[in-house]
């Protein structure tokens, strides 16, 4: 039975050109994490394998940095980065756990409109 739960950073609204950290944490299970995949809209961004370490997809290499921990740092954000990101935890013996984070990247003009939030 899968008893674990994924906690995420929560949804994030950020400004174009900035950087943000996406993180997930698997709790309430003793299952062993064998690999964590980071994906966006069916595109693989990065893999962190327990044995082989990190692999960043070539198309994201210049803007995606591994960590902290099993998280992912996205740099030089563009409005095209707006979308849903998935952390997919492959575990043994439980199977797969998935967390969801929505990232909204705003143009400066939109970000300033009615802005009373702190923007990372």
């Amino acid at each position: 039975m899968m008893t674990g739960t994924i906690e995420t950073t929560g949804n994030i609204s950020a400004e174009k050109g900035g950087s943000i950290i996406l993180q997930c944490h698997l709790s309430s299970t003793t299952a062993q994490v064998t690999q964590v995949n980071w994906e966006q809209q069916d595109q693989l961004l990065a893999i962190c394998n327990a044995d082989l370490g990190w692999h960043i997809s070539p198309s994201f290499k210049d803007r995606v940095a591994p960590g902290p921990g099993l998280g992912l740092t996205l740099q030089s954000l563009t409005v095209n980065d707006t979308g849903e990101y998935f952390c997919i935890y492959h575990t043994y013996p439980d199977g797969t756990y998935t967390g969801r984070i929505f990232l909204e990247v705003l143009e400066s003009s939109v970000a300033e409109h009615g802005a009373r939030f702190q923007i990372p």
């Epitope: 995420t8 950073t9 929560g10 949804n11 994030i12 609204s13 943000i20 950290i21 993180q23 966006q40 809209q41 409005v79 095209n80 707006t82 979308g83 849903e84 969801r100 984070i101 929505f102 909204e104 705003l106 143009e107 939109v110 409109h113 009615g114 009373r116 939030f117 702190q118 990372p120």
Partner: antibody, heavy 117, light 112 residues
Framework: EVQLQQSGPELVKPGASMKISCKAS????????MNWVKQSHGKNLEWIGL????????SYNQKFKGKATLTVDKSSSTAYMELLSLTSEDSAVYYC??????????WGQGTTLTVSS | DVVVTQTPLSLPVSFGDQVSISCRSS???????????LSWYLHKPGQSPQLLIY???NRFSGVPDRFSGSGSGTDFTLKISTIKPEDLGMYYC?????????FGGGTKLEIK
Amino acid sequence: EVQLQQSGPELVKPGASMKISCKASGYSFTGYTMNWVKQSHGKNLEWIGLIVPNNGGTSYNQKFKGKATLTVDKSSSTAYMELLSLTSEDSAVYYCARSLRFSFDYWGQGTTLTVSS
Amino acid sequence: DVVVTQTPLSLPVSFGDQVSISCRSSQSLANSYGTTYLSWYLHKPGQSPQLLIYGISNRFSGVPDRFSGSGSGTDFTLKISTIKPEDLGMYYCLQGTHQPPTFGGGTKLEIK
């Protein structure tokens, strides 16, 4: 002035599919995400999903995956929601709503869907 | 999914009253940057829902200052300082911090 103009009420038969439109005006359509919300029995509000007009990306409430399909036509600044394999449970008022920082700042007028044989 | 519980379900009022509506979430609504995406809406019969408050306490443009929002973590409150006829309707809170966004069950503000 920001406006979201939705298509009119629909009466459809069980098993059919239908598409609701939401035409945006008064702002940059690609600069904001568009959400869809279901209101059943005049009370409960449920988030169905959203679409990012800029890149076509979508995010769905798992409950509505396979039931709703979201698309956009950037050239006409219009968002669409297709509802599939309709049953009486799908009878409701459906709203499109623009979002900024995960709050819904402007809403369409709502589209009433009645599923009945 | 995050469960959002609104109380009370119904709130009978007289014009001029001050009222509070509570919204509680099953987990903290602060993201890792300390930003909380909690908003409040008024839905009047025959109209679309309208945004009142975003980000816990920020009034949306054109919203009168008799509406105020407060709270943190899992506990949030909407206060209306002097009820007017145009304030009657259903009030909803919405959490937008976690996927999927979820609404509270609503509070009906009606005349006693």
